[in-house]
Amino acid sequence: KSSNEATNITPKHNMKAFLDELKAENIKKFLYNFTQIPHLAGTEQNFQLAKQIQSQWKEFGLDSVELAHYDVLLSYPNKTHPNYISIINEDGNEIFNTSLFEPPPPGYENVSDIVPPFSAFSPQGMPEGDLVYVNYARTEDFFKLERDMKINCSGKIVIARYGKVFRGNKVKNAQLAGAKGVILYSDPADYFAPGVKSYPDGWNLPGGGVQRGNILNLNGAGDPLTPGYPANEYAYRRGIAEAVGLPSIPVHPIGYYDAQKLLEKMGGSAPPDSSWRGSLKVPYNVGPGFTGNFSTQKVKMHIHSTNEVTRIYNVIGTLRGAVEPDRYVILGGHRDSWVFGGIDPQSGAAVVHEIVRSFGTLKKEGWRPRRTILFASWDAEEFGLLGSTEWAEENSRLLQERGVAYINADSSIEGNYTLRVDCTPLMYSLVHNLTKELKSPDEGFEGKSLYESWTKKSPSPEFSGMPRISKLGSGNDFEVFFQRLGIASGRARYTKNWETNKFSGYPLYHSVYETYELVEKFYDPMFKYHLTVAQVRGGMVFELANSIVLPFDCRDYAVVLRKYADKIYSISMKHPQEMKTYSVSFDSLFSAVKNFTEIASKFSERLQDFDKSNPIVLRMMNDQLMFLERAFIDPLGLPDRPFYRHVIYAPSSHNKYAGESFPGIYDALFDIESKVDPSKAWGEVKRQIYVAAFTVQAAAETLSEVA
């Protein structure tokens, strides 16, 4: 059959027609529509938006659009009993209280149902005690406190600045250190870029602005009460004491005006070095406790939030494939927001909406993709990636057999400097080739390709003339597809200049000030960066769904596997004596990587030469490509993290947002010098090398000639 059997226009024209149909003005309109009221997960407003999107996707021309609902554990503040933190004197009187809400932005003063800042899933409690400042509350920060500075956090309330790592890791670290409460705050050093005004006059965080967010440590479990299975009507739910990933100590976020009041009184030790100092006019003393005249004062937390099983709704749209309807390419992003969601998620949802509209337009003209495209508007992402994970749990058997790729579509922008891509190595060549065909939206790059501006502004640290592409971590809805199911995944957005802007994320992240006006006035007035992101995300989906041979290059996996093996070997070689003592060898891993490289090379040669008009051989070769990512899945999962099953990549155990390579070996080696039983610890290193070597070898064999 001809290569364009699914369509009445030539393949090249298809992509051009699809891309030409994408309009910045539409994205702008959709963003405005999605951001006028809050769309908190589990609320009526978000259910109404789900129904609106369902209706519009049907109008756009999708074959079917369904709502998929689940009853999951969510968390909300108590409306009549607000959360706050106080400084109390020796008589127990509250002499200072933190604010109960963010001052609303201009034009939004009369909006109801703005959830006040809170840490989702915090338990209730009113702990009081001395304060310890723990910097970013990273693993290394607690090592510094406990091992170097000899400061014991047990029984203390810790105050940590947001940034660098996922907030859930901060809370986990504080719990392990014995803290009885955690205060999270946004320091201007991380959330106030120099030379830029505070919202509403600029894109910086005002002193009363606060970052909301969940503080779970789910490790990919989804709904805390139904790990591994969908939270459907007949679900068996765990008791709250057995729920996955819930914090055990009260946690609350504050802005930097309130943080100043707490930090200015800190006594105890000076900060260990400049990396512990933020930008407030305080000494950043670590504590414990307050200084001098204030030494009898304590900090008290008042947390009254509740966890509630609540219904959530995903919107799932289908555009049936004409040739391979049983092969799924998925484009998904979340719909729920903390407040208005001006950037997170609606800048992404608006792009998805426009991509759906463009695909629908082509379909109405008689075109169909070769493979089925699924579009998803996920719910409850902010509460732990719940909507996407529950849906994937419900459909796991279909997905593991039919899932070709997943493209994530959360926030389209976190800056307006250059492109940022994280994806499986299988997609490197797809991303390179696509961005070479797209126009750069950047000033000074008129008439140049996106690839050129991206490479210039964000060069690869390893390969000259190529752009940086990062490892997938987590903290977004691709997690279940990639880390649990082994479906090739990628994400793309416009980002800031990481070299000049050292703040974490974007300043107004998860605050009430994340509005439509923030985007329209300060980030992307022409919506040209949104359009570019739509072209990248949409273009990737188009190619994945429509190319005759899947646009995956297994040789790129071989290259990174060698790089990752070299890296983990060099980490282990910091302990040469122990490696000798316990006979630790990486030979099996390097041998497996070598075999993978040779087999991938031969497979790529066959891919060039085979008869593409033979549908059986074509399907066979495509299946080998599709199932390669799946081959890196270990059904037993990583130690203590059963839902992180990818052997090559997992979210870092110290920062959910970051990806770690050969995570099993990495975690076994981490802090190994402090382990009480070195023989056992090095035995686990050897076991993890064995698992990794076996998995790489097994994956290589899936690319061998089938007979």
């Epitope: 510094k144 091992r147 006594g267 105890g268 000076a270 260990p272 070095d273 990396s275 001098g292 402090s674």
Partner: antibody, heavy 115, light 107 residues
């Protein structure tokens, strides 16, 4: 056993610079703060600055007005202290110390500044 | 800068007797005080941190106490090997500052 071994004695002319090294062993280098302290003949101890070997974060004593630079080389577990624009009053024994509380000390390096 | 004032400048104590060394901070430093021992032609050694916690391997005849501005190092029963100069240091604020030292001798 934790050890800090410093480079040998130096004689410098006024206006010159000196760079003293401190090679550590017996512990995880990135875990402990490295401080530099000096002691003029017959005098007390004077803190010059410190570094977090994990991320290179430094704090200096303002008294040295940008004359001091502290660095580390993680690959060799070595810390360095460079003092520029030397004057005669910089003649002292310079110590490195590991640990926030100066838990472990080097043997000291005598720097003599003389024309 | 916080000034650490040690007294006395020197102290002569009989073997087996108690030696009490004083250190006063010019402002409140909480308990962020260390004590060091320096023997002739040697590097200093950490004795006490957080005003009262003995460093690993330090004999229990050395005791630190105090908080705020007044701190004391006590050697409960002076031994010959305790002859040295003892320095206090504050680490409550930068720059970290040492006292001028107290010289302990045998009477």
């Amino acid at each position: 056993e934790v050890q800090l071994v410093q480079s040998g004695a130096e004689v410098k002319k006024p206006g010159a610079s000196v760079k003293v090294s401190c090679k550590t062993s017996g512990y995880t280098f990135t875990e402990y703060t490295i401080h530099w302290v000096r002691q003029a003949p017959g005098q007390s101890l004077e803190w010059m600055g410190n570094i977090n070997p994990n991320n290179g974060g430094t704090t200096y004593n303002q008294k040295f007005q940008g004359r001091v630079t502290i660095t580390v080389d993680k690959s060799t577990s070595t810390a360095y202290m460079e003092l520029s624009s030397l004057r005669s009053e910089d003649t002292a024994v310079y110590y490195c110390a590991a640990g926030w509380n100066f838990d472990y000390w080097g043997q000291g390096t005598l720097v003599t500044v003389s024309s | 800068d916080i000034v650490m004032t040690q007294s006395p400048d020197s102290l002569a104590v009989s073997l087996g007797e108690r030696a009490t060394l004083s250190c006063r901070a010019s402002q409140d430093v909480g308990t962020a005080v260390d004590w060091y021992q320096q023997k002739p032609d040697q590097s200093p050694k950490l004795l006490i941190y957080w005003a009262s916690t003995r460093h690993t391997g330090v004999p229990d005849r050395f005791t630190g106490s105090g908080s705020g501005t007044d701190f004391t190092l006590t050697i409960s029963s002076l031994q010959a090997e305790d002859v040295a100069v003892y320095f206090c240091k504050q680490y409550n604020s930068y720059p970290l500052t040492f006292g001028a030292g107290t010289k302990v001798e045998i009477k």
